[in-house]
Amino acid sequence: FEIALPRESNITVLIKLGTPTLLAKPCYIVISKRHTTMLSIKPGERILFTFSCQSPENHFVIEIQKNIDCMSGPCPFGEVQLQPSTSLLPTLNRTFIWDVKAHKSIGLELQFSIPRLRQFGPGESCPDGVTYSISGRIDATVVRIGTFCSNGTVSRIKMQEGVKMALHLPWFHPRNVSGFSIANRSSIKRLCIIESVFEGEGSATLMSANYPEGFPEDELMTWQFVIPAHLRASVSFLNFNLSNCERKEERVEYYIPGSTTNPEVFKLEDKQPGNMAGNFNLSLQGCDQDAQNPGILRLQFQVLVQHPQNESNKIYVVDLSNERATSLTIEPRPVKQSRKFVPGCFVCLESRTCSTNLTLTSGSKHKISFLCDNLTRLWMNVEKNISCTDHRYCQRKSYSLQVPSDIFHLPVELHDFSWKLLVPKDRLSLVLVPAQKLQQHTHEKPCNTSFSYLVASAIPSQDLYFGSFCPGGSIEQIQVKQNISVTLRTFAPSFRQEASRQGLTVSFIPYFKEEGVFTVTPDTKSKVYLRTPNWDRGLPSLTSVSWNISVPRDQVACLTFFKERTGVVCQTGRAFMIIQEQRTRAEEIFSLDEDALPKPRFHHHSFWVNISNCSPASGKQLDLLFWVTLTPRTVDLT
């Protein structure tokens, strides 16, 4: 190889060992008869050399630095050439560095040809290995503006006082153009301006200077976004830190087209604007930091640009002004992310404050809109607290647990509507009465409706799940001892059509000691499957539950247990079951930890099944499944 550098080129070439590899044989640069591991070639010099090995790219790297002095004479503006041409250089990983020094009053603009640049953060790399590292200067301090790959949106970077630009090309890359040009501009009066141009839908992740280290103190950095008129942009902060300010406040400022309050000033912890039409600017302003404990200011953010959907132009009013203790959250459904560009899915408050999730609280009217390619990517979860603090006032009081019609007007699916029902301890209990009798969901007879009610204890220390219930069964009411949550969970969009079938009434009733009582009136046409709460995890220790099973006058009920034995092993106490005829009060007691469960048995009259648990040994829990069938009395049952 021969490298001869023109003396006025201000180019220096350095060939040196790259990152050490575990290659057995060393490799040398051979110049005449000498072997060396480092070679520096300065302007006006001419060097002939070879390598002592077959694959020098595994050992050496080459750096080509060009110093461009804009202080003492005119600046060589225009397209930047790769000099020496890559065809004249040995095939090593190569880094071209351009170091431009200019007066503070001169703005320098780097212009990148298509396919533009994409900024990447720590720990990332470029697919083709081609990277641009761009630094600026504040007095004598070098400031890293960022590291970039090809195929992005960054079209121009404006700086002043100087630029250091490094283009890294892997040895196998055929590229022979720099891909950028330099132009002079008037002073930009800030650290830098990064222009990001979107041609269509897409996203860009950008970072403050020096990221992930701290942004220079009291500096200003601006990003200019060029957005096609028919698209919308949303900003979200992926990661940020605030420093300790002595004077002024760290903030971001937006110049948004059509805004009457430009610049719009936001704290970094605020929700950032979304659903913006047209070009906009975002600026990061640092502060005077505490000298003793400066901390660091840093910001990594994403701009997402996408088509507004039909829904984006609609404003939905969610009137929670008459509601109490209610919160409505619209959020993304959990889905596996694909690797390709996924348009954002945002919900916007007052059309501007957009985020991936939004919680609305009671007491106000809220105006919301959506910026989302597919609203099935979102769902809605509502929580409402109904509490009684004074037992004398609440007793016998009833509340309807019904999804408000306002919610059906929203274009997103309801996932959960949870009512937290809170009662004064040991004073009141609750009864749930459905508009339509309920079926308990079991493996043997699963619910196939578009929604279910999930009933669980709402006492933090108690892990008690009564079960999942859907309309179309035999359970007339559920009585529970204390605080519970009732969650209406939807399973299909057809819930909107079936909404009329929903409806539970909750009433506060005098306190009783059992954890739960289910009132069951079996249907003559089908089996009623019933199972103990906390199925698969076992009925909690020392818990008691009952089923009040009504038998119509002309029917006989057959009670059948799923297993011969419960399998429960008691650590302390006894687990037992009482089956009691309601008319005669005759009862049978079964020891669940010792006895076999009774064989199928017939009841001519209504009866109780009561199960009381001991403190079971771990892994030997009490789970019980049974079913009831009715047959007409005329049939000979013997």
Epitope: R34, G44, L48
Partner: antibody, heavy 120, light 112 residues
Framework: EVQLVESGGGLVQPGGSLRLSCAAS????????MNWVRQAPGKGLEWVAN????????DYVDSVKGRFTISRDNAKNSLFLQMSSLRAEDTAVYYC?????????????WGQGTLVTVSS | DIVMTQSPLSLPVTPGEPASISCRSS???????????LDWFLQKPGQSPQLLIF???DRASGVPDRFSGSGSGTDFTLKISRVETEDVGVYYC?????????FGQGTRLEIK
């Protein structure tokens, strides 16, 4: 045997032009950098210009920049020096010299020289 | 530009005696490759210059071994172990490190 033979020298008036040639033989001309070096009567040697193998890069001593142009024709194994706006101080014997095939700018072969006299 | 300074400018020598010429550069000629880019030429009367020494100490082909070059950085020496009458002429040092290529003023060797 390597040979370099200069021609084209002569008497020229100040401000005038002259074109020197150097015919190369005995080596692969297109593989070597070539130079012009001059020597004023009774004085030392002064490097004037050089040209890369393919003619893509050229360099000149400051005193001749913008007035002299070095060029080559690899097909004809020839090196040229086009001199214009000649001055009295350009009077010298002009040698063409080959850069040896190793690092640096060492001249391993020189021509016999051609005299250029600038005088009115 | 790198300035080359030779001394002495004139050197009368008796045949068979050694001779030594010094050359100093305004900047180090020692390259990162480990080579000193300094050459010595002899221009015999009425002839064109001929290369004696390149890279500070390497003799050019056909050059008698009584000629040797030494030195590094900025100070270099050409030695002739036993001067012969055919060695008469002007000796030039030249920096071959970078353009513009520059020569010393020359040292005239003459027989006493």
């Amino acid at each position: 045997e390597v040979q370099l033979v200069e021609s084209g020298g002569g008497l020229v008036q100040p401000g005038g032009s002259l074109r020197l040639s150097c015919a190369a033989s005995g080596f692969t001309f297109s593989r070597y950098w070539m130079n012009w070096v001059r020597q004023a009567p009774g004085k030392g040697l002064e490097w004037v210009a050089n040209i890369k193998q393919d003619g893509s890069e050229k360099d000149y001593v400051d005193s001749v920049k913008g007035r002299f142009t070095i060029s080559r024709d690899n097909a004809k194994n020839s090196l040229f020096l086009q001199m214009s706006s000649l001055r009295a101080e350009d009077t010298a014997v002009y040698y063409c010299a080959r850069v040896m095939y190793s690092s640096g700018w060492s001249f391993d072969y020189w021509g016999q020289g051609t005299l250029v006299t600038v005088s009115s | 530009d790198i300035v080359m300074t030779q001394s002495p400018l004139s050197l009368p020598v008796t045949p068979g005696e050694p001779a030594s010429i010094s050359c100093r550069s305004s900047r180090s000629l020692l390259h990162s490759s480990g080579y000193n880019f300094l050459d010595w030429f002899l221009q015999k009367p009425g002839q064109s210059p001929q290369l004696l020494i390149f890279l500070g100490s390497d003799r050019a082909s056909g050059v008698p071994d009584r000629f040797s070059g030494s030195g590094s950085g900025t100070d270099f020496t050409l030695k002739i172990s036993r001067v012969e009458t055919e060695d008469v002429g002007v000796y030039y040092c030249m920096q071959a490190l970078q353009t513009p290529i520059t020569f010393g003023q020359g040292t005239r060797l003459e027989i006493k």
